[in-house]
């Protein structure tokens, strides 16, 4: 579908006759009759099979024609077709004289023909006109002429048919040709899938309009390519929505449960070794030198007591040194040249002859140890107790004293207020709003009943010379522990002096 | 052959929601060429197109109805789905489910579900 | 086009050609379809784009459209023919507007 236009620019009729020669009265008043037909190698007269026009008197014997496309549409002419354009054409103008108003060819005389033209050729799709002049014995037609095609037909025939759009179902313009050219942000055969944001997920992601990245469910992230994990999920990844796939050291339904206490929150001090026992429990393994729960005090050798029989210790650079009282010998003073007659072995420790009675062997009692049974048994330097519990000499045995939230022998269960039993000697347990509290029966004291109140058999001070002062639990006797410098079973006894045993 | 099922309450009260699902049967909803569309006709009234979905979940409602209309799409089922908020007698009609997209025309409907009668009434 | 405007109704002996018509403000501009209900039954696609039968459509089915108004146009019409038929067009706000349906009578 498209359009012939055609514009009448000049017609020259100097002497203003007709084509038979007679002049007009007063003048010729000219107007046009068009035919548009298809090619004809000799155009000959028939059907207008492409269309005809006429013109109303558009001037007389010479004269320009004005463009008048603004007012009416008379000049350029219109022959619209309805119809694939050929590419060629034949065109017959003809010139005519009108002495009345009335323009019909029945209301016509024969001889008021002024002139006619007859042209034929090739003519392409185009907005350029085709500029041409005829000129016959009297007259000379100056005009031009175009084919364009109709509104929403396009392409070298016009037979595209294409109309541009912007809604929903679909955003172009159309091209020269025909097709649809996609406005900026949209794709798809009619234009109507939004581009999304560059790099959204194909599957996880979609927009409703171009430079968007709306997630579908389970997913997030400007560009929807970060699953979401299972809601509550606190030390956890997922590769799929909804999962919760525990960091390393944590476990759970949540990864709430902190299997790795000593990574996340590396408790052992000093360059102690820490061991894993458990959701949020640990062990710490001192270096030499160290100690406590998480091997934050610093130990001197001295202090684990390695003399015995009462002699005094002395920390050095590389170790310690043993001052052993008369009657002992050896690196921890653990060799004795008394006899069974010199009543070596202390509390309540029973005297065996050895090798003739040149030498003894003391068989002590539950929670005394040493040659002389002068040490009271420690059964907490190997740090049995677990989630930082405080080890305690109880008699012949030991004790875990538990931190909150934890229970059991070597506080490895978690248990929670009063369920962890924490009151100690049969203490009766009160669940508090913050806590709890205990109430101890007679004879013990402290928050968890774990202090015994029975008589103390050092709170006389028997022990002289500043030496360190252990009670028997059992017997509710004393055991001194020397300093450099003193022996003797209070210390009383300086190096060198000999003792007068009062036994 | 595509074809088209709609399946719904048959009688809503006023002011509650109609619930409505569309199920495509001999081919797949998610077809890039093809749209899904909802119309609706009152008895003895004309058509009036509702809205449509594409699969990937983009949607496109009447202004007119654009406040109380939503759809959905779910690929797993098949289907796609309307709900219309806070109906009144106006909203009686036979709803049909259509494809959209003949000759590549995103806005052609080819081919209908046989309609589904829905009564607003107390 | 916001509104598409048919007559209600056309009467045509079988055999007669029907023309059943739709206009809108600048209706040409955009792409029409018609549909044929028949009572009872769900609409059916005869004319896309204007001028276009969806295979399975007889030939005595054309469409037209250019300026204001679109046309159908029922050549040698059938009993069979008689039904409700509905255009179809877009605007800028409206992504589908059907025209109001003319219930065509063949006598």
């Known amino acids: 579908s498209g359009v012939f236009q055609l514009q009448l620019q000049e017609f020259i009729n100097e002497r203003g006759v007709l084509a038979s020669g007679r002049p007009c009265e007063p003048g010729c008043r000219t107007f046009f009759r068009v035919c548009l037909k298809h090619f004809q190698a000799v155009v000959s007269p028939g059907p207008c099979t492409f269309g005809t026009v006429s013109t109303p008197v558009l001037g007389t014997n010479s004269f320009a024609v004005r463009d008048d496309s603004s007012g009416g549409g008379r000049n350029p002419l219109q022959l619209p077709f309805n119809f694939t354009w050929p590419g060629t054409f034949s065109l017959i103008i003809e010139a005519w004289h009108a002495p009345g108003d009335d323009l019909r060819p029945e209301a016509l005389p024969p001889d008021a023909l002024i002139s006619k033209i007859a042209i034929q050729g090739s003519l392409a799709v185009g907005q350029n006109w085709l500029l041409d002049e005829q000129t016959s014995t009297l007259t000379r037609l100056r005009y031009s002429y175009r084919v364009i095609c109709s509104d929403n037909y396009y392409g070298d025939n016009c037979s595209r048919l294409c109309k541009k759009r912007n809604d929903h179902f679909g955003h172009y313009v159309c091209q020269p040709d025909g097709n649809l050219s996609c406005l900026p942000g949209w794709t798809g055969e009619y234009c109507q899938q939004p581009i999304c944001l560059s790099g959204c997920h194909e599957q996880n992601g979609y927009c409703s309009k171009p430079a968007e990245c709306l997630c579908r469910p389970g997913w997030q992230g400007r560009l929807c390519n970060e699953c979401i994990p299972h809601n509550g999920c606190r030390h956890g990844t997922c590769s799929t929505p909804w999962q919760c796939t525990c960091d390393e050291g944590w476990g759970g339904l949540f990864c709430d449960q902190d299997l790795n206490y000593c990574t996340h929150h590396s408790p052992c001090k000093n360059g102690a070794t820490c061991s894993n026992s458990g959701q949020r429990s640990y062990t710490c393994t001192c270096r030499p030198g160290y100690t406590g729960v998480d091997c934050e005090l610093e130990l001197s050798e001295c202090d684990s007591n390695p003399c015995r029989n009462g002699g005094s210790c002395k920390d050095q650079e590389d170790g310690y040194h043993c001052l052993c009282p008369p009657g002992y010998y050896g690196l921890h003073c653990e060799h004795s040249t008394l006899s069974c007659a010199d009543s070596p072995c202390f509390n309540g420790g029973s005297c065996r002859e050895r090798n003739q009675g040149a030498n003894y062997a003391c068989e002590c009692p539950p929670n005394f140890t040493g040659s002389n049974c002068e040490k009271k048994v420690d059964r907490c330097t190997s740090n049995p107790c677990a989630n930082g519990g405080q080890c305690l000499n109880r008699g012949p045995s030991r004790m875990c004293r538990c931190r909150p939230g934890f229970t059991g022998t070597y506080c490895e269960l978690h248990v929670s207020d009063c369920a962890r039993n924490p009151c100690a000697h049969g203490g009766t347990c009160h669940d508090l709003e913050n806590g709890l509290m205990c109430t101890c029966p007679a004879g013990f004291s402290g928050r968890r009943c774990e202090v015994r109140t029975s008589i103390d058999a050092c709170a006389s001070s028997p022990c002289f010379n500043r030496a360190t002062c252990y009670t028997d639990l059992s017997t509710d006797t004393f055991v001194c522990n020397c300093p450099y410098g003193f022996v003797g079973s209070r210390c009383e006894f300086p190096v060198g002096l000999p003792p007068s045993f009062p036994w | 052959q595509l074809q088209l099922q709609e399946s719904g309450p048959g009688l809503v009260k006023p002011s509650e929601t109609l619930s409505l699902s569309c199920t495509v049967s001999g081919g797949s909803i998610s077809s890039s060429s093809s749209y899904w569309g909802l119309i609706r006709q009152p008895p003895g009234k004309g058509l009036e197109w509702i809205g449509s979905i594409y699969y990937s979940g983009s949607t496109y409602y009447s202004p007119s109805l654009k406040s109380r209309v939503s759809i959905s799409v779910d690929t797993s089922k098949n289907q796609f789905s309307l709900k219309l908020s806070s109906v009144t007698a106006a909203d009686t009609a036979v709803y049909f489910c259509?494809?959209?997209?003949?000759?590549?025309?995103?806005?052609?409907?080819?081919?209908w579900g046989q309609g589904t009668m829905v009564t607003v009434s107390s | 086009s916001s509104e598409l405007t048919q007559s209600p109704s056309v009467s045509v002996s079988p055999g007669q050609t029907a023309r059943i018509t739709c206009s809108g403000d600048k209706l040409g501009d955009v792409y029409v379809r018609w549909y044929q209900q028949k009572t009872g039954q769900s609409p059916v696609l005869v004319i896309y784009?204007?001028?276009k039968r969806p295979s399975g459509i007889p030939e005595r089915f054309s469409g037209s459209n250019s300026g204001n108004t679109a046309t159908l146009t029922i050549s040698g019409t059938q009993v069979m023919d008689e039904a409700d038929y509905y255009c179809q067009a877009w605007d800028s706000t409206t992504a589908v507007i059907f025209g109001g349906g003319t219930k065509l009578t063949v006598l």
């Open positions: 784009e204007d001028t």
């Open positions: 259509a494809r959209q997209g003949y000759g590549g025309h995103p806005d052609v409907f080819d081919i």
